[in-house]
Amino acid sequence: SGRGEAETRECIYYNANWELERTNQSGLERCEGEQDKRLHCYASWRNSSGTIELVKKGCWLDDFNCYDRQECVATEENPQVYFCCCEGNFCNERFTHLPEAGGPEVTYEPPPTAPTLLT
């Protein structure tokens, strides 16, 4: 039973590699998936000596480890690329690193933008 689920229909979109991949750089993404499957938003980023470099944001297909996550929180200690996923429209706007071994929680706030809608 999926009791606490927040339906995800739209996510913040970003692609640092947009020129090479011939996509938009940023905006909103409408999520599409198979019937009866849940959808999520995600964010991925690098942290080079405290400087945050966004990699990608967007929709994420049904993934059980994303269920019931209202906030986008990465917990891996020191990966090459940080990853988080969540449920609920635009839940990937803000993202957080909360390392498993303790340490400080770091939340990344997006700069204000006027996003374009991607379909």
């Epitope: 009791r3 606490g4 009866d36 049904d62 993934d63 059980f64 480890n65 269920y67 019931d68 917990t75």
Partner: antibody
Framework: EVQLLESGGGLVQPGGSLRLSCAAS????????MSWVRQAPGKGLEWVSA????????YYTDSVKGRFTVSRDNSRNTLYLQMNSLRAEDTAVYYC???????????WGQGTLVTVSS | QTVVTQEPSFSVSPGGTVTLTCGFN?????????PSWYQQTPGQAPRTLIY???TRSSGVPDRFSGSILGNKAALTITGAQADDESDYYC??????????FGGGTKLTVL
């Protein structure tokens, strides 16, 4: 180091109940979805149940629906499987497993044996 | 009811290459099912080999690789060794919380 330690297995009569526990350490339990997988003697692995990070979403294989209940206590870093109306065909080693992104089992416990017999 | 199928048994010579497959009865396996592979020796807990179709788990030698072959997920072992003799299981994630194991393949190295 990630550790998953199951307990609570044993011999029980058909129709009886057992509660399995899985004590987790070495990772942030409240941030991980979890699952139970079982293996009958001489048989293959079978997924039994899964529970989301908050416990708000729970899922079961058809053969245990209505008889088994999965739950978690994030303050105690413990996963549970309450098994009621047990049948001979529930006899198996029960493993708890941590579920990671891409919905795979990245860590496994050593298992606890449940024997249902009269 | 989804049934995930694997070859019941397979033999490979030491140093040889073997490909185990994983399909299901309701269509083609794709990356959206996040195919994963596990190795199990008798009396031991399973060990994670491959996840997300083709990503090796930490500490798994690069002799093990995963892919999609046609309409199935595949696990390839190149340069098979005696201690690769084990049972191998694939898992497909069907969505909505449901994971389905294949019946397993008993691999013999001889």
């Amino acid at each position: 180091e990630v550790q998953l330690l199951e307990s609570g297995g044993g011999l029980v009569q058909p129709g009886g109940s057992l509660r399995l526990s899985c004590a987790a350490s070495g990772f942030t339990f409240r941030n991980s979805a979890m699952s139970w997988v079982r293996q009958a003697p001489g048989k293959g692995l079978e997924w039994v149940s899964a529970i989301s990070v908050t416990g708000g979403s729970t899922y079961y294989t058809d053969s245990v629906k209505g008889r088994f209940t999965v739950s978690r206590d994030n303050s105690r870093n413990t996963l549970y499987l309450q098994m009621n109306s047990l049948r001979a065909e529930d006899t198996a080693v029960y493993y708890c497993a941590k579920v990671y992104y891409y919905s795979f089992f990245d860590y496994w416990g050593q298992g606890t044996l449940v024997t249902v017999s009269s | 009811q989804t049934v995930v199928t694997q070859e019941p048994s397979f033999s490979v010579s030491p140093g040889g290459t073997v490909t185990l497959t994983c399909g299901f009865n309701s269509g083609s396996v794709s990356t959206s099912y996040y195919p994963s592979w596990y190795q199990q020796t008798p009396g031991q807990a399973p060990r994670t080999l491959i996840y997300n179709t083709n990503t090796r788990s930490s500490g798994v030698p690069d002799r093990f690789s995963g892919s999609i072959l046609g309409n199935k997920a595949a696990l390839t072992i190149t340069g098979a060794q005696a201690d690769d003799e084990s049972d191998y299981y694939c898992v497909l994630y069907m969505g909505s919380g449901i994971h389905v194991f294949g019946g397993g393949t008993k691999l013999t190295v001889l």
